[in-house]
């Protein structure tokens, strides 16, 4: 008789999860020679220890602390790019602008990007059938707590001018319930961060509205200003052109607003 297994509402652990995390870690240390001495087996052991044998609705930031001890990677604190609901463009940007970093350009972010994982209470098994959904099941699940933990630390490390890419096509350009709105905004350190600069990315080709005047952007400005951090906002009317100009800034067509 098969043992009863908790059925969650979300998709199960990504197939070949241990192998994927280990392979990504090795690849990352090869791409980033400053991390060449990282022992990826130890990284996986710490990652695994955060959720294996634990109830997947009872995960805490404390569970990830052993793994976070690796999170001292020296990303330049003034080259941080946050994003909300526009991950692909943010990543395309940092692939071109190599001296800027999203969370997923750091080792821990790179390891977990787009993956799902959870375990089961009191067994060493990984649950490949289902994992808790943030809304339908519980918020203290392994994936959500991981991203909350690393996002908080990433925001805390930021300094000088911090950039955030926001999706202008969404009804809430700034969403207080997003990771950016609920975690990162509140963990920027006013004594280190001078300005948060928002880049609002337009979706439609003929969209010439000033989305920096959107009520949700004004709400973001209010939250940031109350935290004694300056706020600025720019419309990126043509994201394709924006990327092209990052690649070739000397192009004569890149002088006008994009």
């Amino acid at each position: 008789v098969p043992r009863w297994r908790q059925q969650w509402s979300g998709p199960g652990t990504t197939k070949r999860f241990p192998e994927t995390v280990l392979a990504r870690c090795v690849k990352y240390t090869e791409i980033h020679p400053e991390m060449r001495h990282v022992d990826c087996q130890s990284v996986w052991d710490a990652f695994k220890g955060a959720f294996i044998s634990k109830h997947p609705c009872n995960i805490t930031e404390e569970d990830y602390q052993p793994l976070m001890k690796l999170g001292t990677q020296t990303v330049p604190c003034n080259k941080i790019l946050l994003w909300s609901r526009i991950k692909d463009l943010a990543h395309q940007f940092t692939q071109v602008q190599r001296d800027m970093f999203t969370l997923e350009d750091t080792l821990l972010g790179y390891l977990a990007d787009d993956l799902t994982w959870c375990g089961e209470f009191n067994t060493s098994k990984i649950n490949y059938q289902s994992c808790p959904d943030w809304r339908k099941d519980c918020s203290n699940n392994p994936v959500s707590v991981f991203w909350k933990t690393v996002s908080r630390r990433f925001a805390e490390a930021a300094c000088d001018v911090v950039h955030v890419m926001l999706n202008g096509s969404r009804s809430k350009i700034f969403d207080k319930n997003s990771t950016f709105g609920s975690v990162e905004v509140h963990n920027l350190q006013p004594e280190k961060v001078q300005t948060l600069e928002a880049w609002v990315i337009h979706g439609g080709r003929e969209d010439s509205r000033d989305l920096c005047q959107d009520p949700t952007i004004k709400e973001l400005e209010s939250i940031i200003s109350k935290r004694n951090i300056q706020f600025s906002c720019k419309n990126i009317y043509r994201p394709d052109k924006f990327l092209q100009c990052v690649k070739n800034p000397e192009d004569s067509s890149c002088t006008s607003e994009i």
Partner: antibody, heavy 118, light 110 residues
Framework: QVQLVESGGGLVKPGGSLRLSCAAS????????MSWIRQAPGKGLEWVAS????????YYADSVRGRFTISRDNAKNSLYLQMNSLRAEDTAVYYC???????????WGQGTLVTVSS | QAGLTQPPSASGTSGQRVTISCSGS????????VYWYQHLPGTAPKLLIY???QRPSGVPDRFSGSKSGNSASLAISGLRSEDEADYYC???????????FGSGTKVTVL
């Protein structure tokens, strides 16, 4: 085969300066991280500084930060250590070392002795 | 600055097995590779073990390395007179953004 030859050691007064050089051959110098490691008389090995390949990033031990500068000249296959504000506790044999792909010191020079004394 | 902790000495008779421990923390050994070096007086140090347990070509298989948690060890089996030397463990340390060496262990063949 890989060869690392240090030079520039000698006797210097406290507060003085010295520049060590390391001539490298037998491998593609510009591809590898390079380091300086020292051993004070009767003491153990102590890492001093490292410099990356590519656009150089430098790393220093707390004991020398702000006083020593590591640099490299890939065109000359040479590694340098500029030592300023020298102290008696900097007296040591200084080794130049090549780093492998996993951070290990694969090849070492024979060392050059630096003596800081009045 | 705090380094890695090694016993000051270890000894054994010819043919015996000797183990040297190296203890650190999560900021060094815990998440980073451990390296072992052999140093004979008046010569350049020599890499014995890298990536916790890998031997460079030319290093006899009498030398083996292992790592568990925040500690590592070097084992020398079939001890020989030419193994008399100082042995150092080393690892990168995140909190220092640099390498740390152990204090060194002098191995004597009785």
């Amino acid at each position: 085969q890989v060869q690392l030859v240090e030079s520039g050691g000698g006797l210097v007064k406290p507060g003085g300066s010295l520049r060590l050089s390391c001539a490298a051959s037998g491998f593609t110098f510009s591809d590898d991280y390079m380091s300086w490691i020292r051993q004070a008389p009767g003491k153990g090995l102590e890492w001093v500084a490292s410099v990356s390949n590519g656009r150089p990033t430098t790393y220093y031990a707390d004991s020398v930060r702000g006083r020593f500068t590591i640099s490299r000249d890939n065109a000359k296959n040479s590694l340098y250590l500029q030592m300023n504000s020298l102290r008696a506790e900097d007296t040591a044999v200084y080794y130049c070392a090549r780093e492998g792909w996993s951070g290990e010191f694969t090849d070492w020079g024979q060392g050059t002795l630096v003596t800081v004394s009045s | 600055q705090a380094g890695l902790t090694q016993p000051p000495s270890a000894s054994g008779t010819s043919g015996q097995r000797v183990t040297i421990s190296c203890s650190g923390s999560s900021s060094n050994i815990g998440f980073h590779f451990v390296y072992w070096y052999q140093h004979l007086p008046g010569t350049a140090p020599k890499l014995l073990i890298y990536k916790n347990n890998q031997r460079p070509s030319g290093v006899p298989d009498r030398f083996s390395g292992s790592k568990s948690g925040n500690s590592a060890s070097l084992a020398i089996s079939g001890l020989r007179s030419e193994d008399e030397a100082d042995y150092y463990c080393a690892a990168w340390d995140d909190s220092l953004s640099g390498y740390v060496f152990g204090s060194g262990t002098k191995v004597t063949v009785l």
